[in-house]
């Protein structure tokens, strides 16, 4: 048990620890406690082992929980006596009844306990505690009385504590050993003397705060503890606390007022006064800042400081600005030689600073005035703006030119310059609002910036913005498109030169809009074909002219294509259209699908006039029969050498129809050897018959071709075997097997195909195809329709 006498005050709790060491018995030890008042024998008090151990006197106190044993470890226990009384003064013995099997050492120990009367008095006893209301920076002091009439030599310790809501903070303590101990956060204020603790008389303890901070608000308690020294160790024997006062820190009243609206002429002085109202008359110092903003909100990022008077009365200001004070409550801002850029909102920002510990300062109040709206009036330039179109487009791709003229009454002023902005607005098609589109804008330094609509075309040189005279701005569209139709207007801005040589826009004047428009009628293209010599026979020259007329096509040039629609033998099939010859807009001729090698120069197409074209076909043949048309395309020039297709039209047809009662040819195939064996000679005859007009054999000629569908490829197309043209020339196709072919004219109307040394591959179906040629009365050969 503790060696020193334990001293306690009536009503407090007595705790005596007891522990046993260096034993061999069970790890968890049992403890018995007994008590002896001065001079009497020991009486059983409490036991961890035997329930019936305590004397009757203590049984009741044990049951009430006034006395209890608390085990703190296997080898340690604490005796707790709550609400200790003078009768509890005496000796307390702790013993371990079952430590070891054999006795080694001491198994009991005794400690003396003294119980003193409560002789500690702590005040004040005022209920409820008073409330102190003060302002930041003001001083306050709180007092607490504490005295002890103890017969023993005791020391008092005192702690000042502040409570704010649930938070408890130590302010300053005086320990029982006479040392001052500032709480966390109070160290600096204690060392600087701002927070002090001293005694007044024999029993009063004073907490002094020389300059209150907002953090000092709260309920202050004085906690006094009494200490006694026993064998060199100090013991706290009791503690008492008292609520001393509630400190309320009132916020300082501070207002800053400036005039609401001020108007000042350009070039004059702006004088603004900031009047301060405050309830502080002590040693606070003001800091005054004037700031400027374009917006009526001083918190916006655009706000800038113009001048500042610091708490040492030093002025910090920008050029042309002065700050002065007539008295401690009135501060002037003077802005010299004002210009338009000084228009805006002015604020007066005031801070009050109170001196703190260690030559430091802390802000006790802050206020910002409502804005002073300042308008700078100036003599604005007086001018008019006129817009007219010097070039109006009649068609797409024509140029447009607009001139924007400034008529200025005082254009000679050196401190005014003019710039232009060009705008486009689409023609309204309905009541919808049509917004203007910026084409170009010129800054005060005459830098030109393009709008989205015009950026690319300006870079391509299609939009040209210029200033050709001192009073005229020009806008030219090199090639006006349909999308460019609409209203154009210009805005001329006047710029005024400032003090710092910068230019500030002072006025905008809008021109009346000019409407760029042309009728967008559909392009019309009409082509008329005619045949100058309507009657002719086969072998004659066919001539056709095409006359073109157009409307709403700018500077047209024409390209011409001659096409023929030929009837196909099968009535259910559509007519076949053939492109014969063409002439482009640059008069370059091209043969299209003219494949007759014998009549390469047989067709001619030429330009007779700008709007007239002539087609000739020499040595016409019966096979040339059909409907002939001119297909004409009109082209408009675009951007120099480029062309745009404006319209295409087809002429009426001119028919070539040979009314003949000529012969009708038929062809048939006959074989003497329809069935052969490999190696035999195959003989096949193509026999032509003629019906109708009798013809001289010299006036007939034939192109004959033989085809076969071989038995090994019945699903394939016929294969050309051999042909004999009207001039008697034989052509034979290449073969992959050994048999040979021969083709000969055996009579006027018979042609013989022979297969020598036939093989399996030669078996199959054979056809002959005949194209007759007949000599016309003019002596030209006419090709007839092919027969099979």
């Amino acid at each position: 048990v503790p060696t020193a006498t334990l001293v306690r005050v009536v009503g407090t709790e007595l705790v005596i620890p007891c522990n046993v060491s260096d034993y061999d018995g069970p790890s968890e030890q049992n403890f018995d406690w007994s008590f002896s008042s001065l001079g009497s024998s020991f009486v059983e008090l409490a036991s961890t082992w035997e329930v019936g151990f305590p004397a009757q006197l203590y049984q009741e106190r044990l049951q009430r929980g006034e006395i209890l044993l608390r085990r703190t470890a296997n080898d340690a226990v604490e005796l707790h006596i709550k609400n200790v009384q003078p009768s509890d003064q005496g000796h307390y013995k702790c013993s371990t009844p079952s430590t070891d099997a054999t006795v080694q050492g001491n198994y009991e120990d005794t400690v003396q306990v003294k119980v003193l009367a409560d002789s500690l008095h702590v005040g004040p006893s005022a209920r409820p505690p008073p409330s102190l209301s003060l302002r930041e920076g003001e001083p306050f002091e709180l007092r607490c009385t504490a005295a002890s009439a103890s017969p023993l030599h005791t020391h008092l310790a005192l702690l000042w504590e502040v409570h704010r809501g649930p938070a408890r903070r130590s302010v300053l303590a005086l320990t029982h050993e006479g040392r001052f101990h500032p709480g966390l956060g109070y160290e600096q204020r204690y060392h600087s003397g701002d927070v002090r603790l001293d005694t007044v008389g024999s029993d009063a303890y004073r907490l002094s705060v020389s300059r209150a901070l907002s953090a000092d608000q709260g309920s202050y308690r004085c906690i006094v503890s009494e200490w006694i020294a026993e064998q060199g160790n100090w013991q706290e024997i009791q503690e008492k606390a008292v609520e001393v006062a509630t400190v309320v820190i009132q916020p300082s009243v501070l207002r800053a007022a400036v005039p609401k609206n001020v108007s000042v002429a350009e070039g004059k002085e702006l004088d603004l006064t900031c009047n301060i109202t405050t309830d502080r008359a002590d040693d606070v110092r003001p800091e005054v800042t004037w700031s400027f903003s374009r917006m009526p909100d001083s918190t916006l990022p655009g706000s800038r400081v113009l001048a500042r008077l610091d708490r040492d009365s030093l002025v910090h200001s920008s050029p042309h600005v002065a700050l002065s004070h007539v008295d401690a409550r009135s501060y002037h801002l003077l802005v010299r030689d004002v210009s338009k850029e000084n228009s805006g909102y002015y604020y007066c920002h005031v801070s009050l600073w109170a001196p703190g510990h260690n030559r430091s300062w802390h802000k006790v109040a802050e206020a910002v005035s409502s804005p002073a709206g300042v308008g700078v009036t100036w003599l604005e330039p007086d001018y008019q703006v006129y817009l007219n179109a010097s070039k109006v487009p009649g068609f797409a791709d024509d140029p447009t030119e607009l001139a924007c003229r400034v008529v200025d009454t005082k254009s000679g002023e050196a401190n005014v310059r003019f710039t232009v902005s060009w705008y486009y607005r689409m023609n309204r098609r309905s009541d919808n609002v049509v917004t203007s589109e910026l084409l170009a804008v010129m800054d005060g330094d005459w830098t030109l910036k393009y709008g989205e609509r015009s950026k690319q075309r300006a870079q391509d040189g299609d939009f040209i913005f210029s200033k050709e005279h001192t009073d005229t701005f020009n806008f030219r569209i090199q090639r006006t498109t349909e999308e460019d139709r609409g209203n154009y207007y210009c805005v001329v801005s006047a710029w005024t030169k400032q003090r710092n040589n910068s230019w500030v826009k002072s006025k905008d004047v809008f021109s009346k809009p000019v409407n760029i428009f042309w009728a967008l009628e559909d392009s019309v293209l009409v082509v008329k074909a005619r045949q100058p010599k309507p009657f002719f026979a086969a072998g004659n020259t066919f001539e056709m002219t095409c006359k073109v007329s157009s409307k709403n096509i700018k500077s047209p040039r024409y390209s011409v294509l001659i096409m023929a629609e030929k009837p196909v033998g099968d009535l259910s099939s559509p007519n076949e259209t053939k492109y014969i010859i063409s002439l482009d807009q640059d008069s370059v001729v091209k043969l299209e699908n003219w494949t007759d090698a014998s009549r390469v120069d047989g067709v001619v197409l030429e330009k007779v006039q700008e709007d007239e074209f002539r087609y000739r076909m020499y040595q016409t043949q019966v096979s040339d029969a059909g409907l002939y048309r001119c297909m004409v395309t009109a082209w408009s020039p675009v951007r120099g050498s480029l062309w745009r297709e404006a319209a295409t039209s087809l002429s009426n047809p001119i028919e070539i129809d040979f009314q003949t009662s000529g012969p009708i040819f038929n062809a048939s195939v006959h074989s003497d050897t329809p069935s052969v064996i490999r190696g035999d000679l195959i003989k096949l005859f193509c026999i032509i018959t003629v019906e109708g007009a009798a013809l001289d054999p010299d006036d007939m000629a034939f192109d004959v071709s033989w085809f076969a569908v071989h038995s090994f490829g019945l699903d394939k197309a016929p294969v050309l075997l051999s042909s004999l043209d009207r001039k008697g020339i034989v052509t034979t196709s290449r073969r992959d097997w050994k048999s040979d072919l021969s083709l000969e004219r055996v009579s006027v109307l018979e042609f013989l195909l022979q297969v020598h040394g036939s093989e399996d591959q030669d078996f199959g179906n054979y056809y002959c195809s005949v194209t007759p040629w007949v000599k016309s009365p003019t002596g030209s050969w006419q090709k007839e329709a092919e027969i099979h």
Epitope: G165, A167, G185, E187, S214
Partner: antibody
Framework: EVQLEESGPELKKPGETVKISCKAS????????MHWVKQAPGKGLKWMGW????????TYADDFKGRFAVSLETSASTAYLQINNLKNEDTATYFC????????????WGQGTSVTVSS | DIVITQSTPSFSVSPGDRVTIICKAS??????LAWYQQKPGNAPRLLIS???SLETGVPSRFSGSGSGKDYALSITSLQTEDVATYYC?????????FGGGTKLEIK
């Protein structure tokens, strides 16, 4: 629920600077102070200093004066610890801890930020 | 500076044991003593403040005692989840200081 959320681990070279953040939530930031505690690998806890969140005033233990700076961003309820001119011996986990209502005892702690200083 | 000594750096314990960890201050710290529990990889957790006040949510098997310079943390019936390092900490005088820690290990 009171929470202190510290920034992520940092790997730095000697001579560099590190700035650790500690974001508070679940209570009024300016009602409690903020403390910083260092724990070197395998070692015990060492109190570095504290900041008064109401006034912004800070106090440092002697071993942490000079290169160490504690600051606040009150609007974001965040405290910062900046260590300049890092040395190898600054390798540690740094905890922020709230100074609670009872005499500023450190009642809630951040999860810690590991700072490794190595060349 | 106030020096805080935790004389026993480590203890080997068994579940169910009663454990007392002792902490001594170099000068009177007026009950401004806190006990923290720290598990590996975690932040410290406040168990006791003001030498004896148990924090909300801390099991009642933990208790604190002492005054002046001598303080103790007791765990009446040790649970396996109590295996950790325990630090005592004085917050009476700046700079605030910690004990070196006492590590509890299972036997």
């Amino acid at each position: 629920e009171v929470q202190l959320e510290e920034s992520g681990p940092e790997l730095k070279k000697p001579g560099e600077t590190v700035k650790i953040s500690c974001k508070a939530s679940g209570y009024t930031f300016t009602d409690s102070s903020m403390h910083w505690v260092k724990q070197a690998p395998g070692k015990g806890l060492k109190w570095m200093g504290w900041i008064n969140t109401e006034t912004g005033e800070s106090t440092y233990a002697d071993d942490f004066k000079g290169r160490f700076a504690v600051s606040l961003e009150t609007s974001a309820s965040t405290a910062y610890l900046q260590i300049n001119n890092l040395k190898n011996e600054d390798t540690a986990t740094y905890f922020c801890a709230r100074g609670g209502p009872n005499y500023y005892v450190m009642d809630y702690w951040g999860q810690g930020t590991s700072v490794t200083v190595s060349s | 500076d106030i020096v805080i000594t935790q004389s026993t750096p480590s203890f080997s314990v068994s579940p169910g044991d009663r454990v007392t960890i002792i902490c001594k201050a170099s000068e009177d710290i007026y009950n401004r003593l806190a006990w923290y529990q720290q598990k590996p990889g975690n932040a410290p957790r406040l168990l006791i403040s003001g030498a004896t006040s148990l924090e909300t949510g801390v099991p009642s098997r933990f208790s604190g005692s002492g005054s002046g310079k001598d303080y103790a943390l007791s765990i009446t019936s040790l649970q396996t989840e109590d295996v950790a390092t325990y630090y005592c900490h004085q917050y009476w005088s700046t700079p605030w200081t910690f004990g070196g820690g006492t590590k509890l290990e299972i036997k």
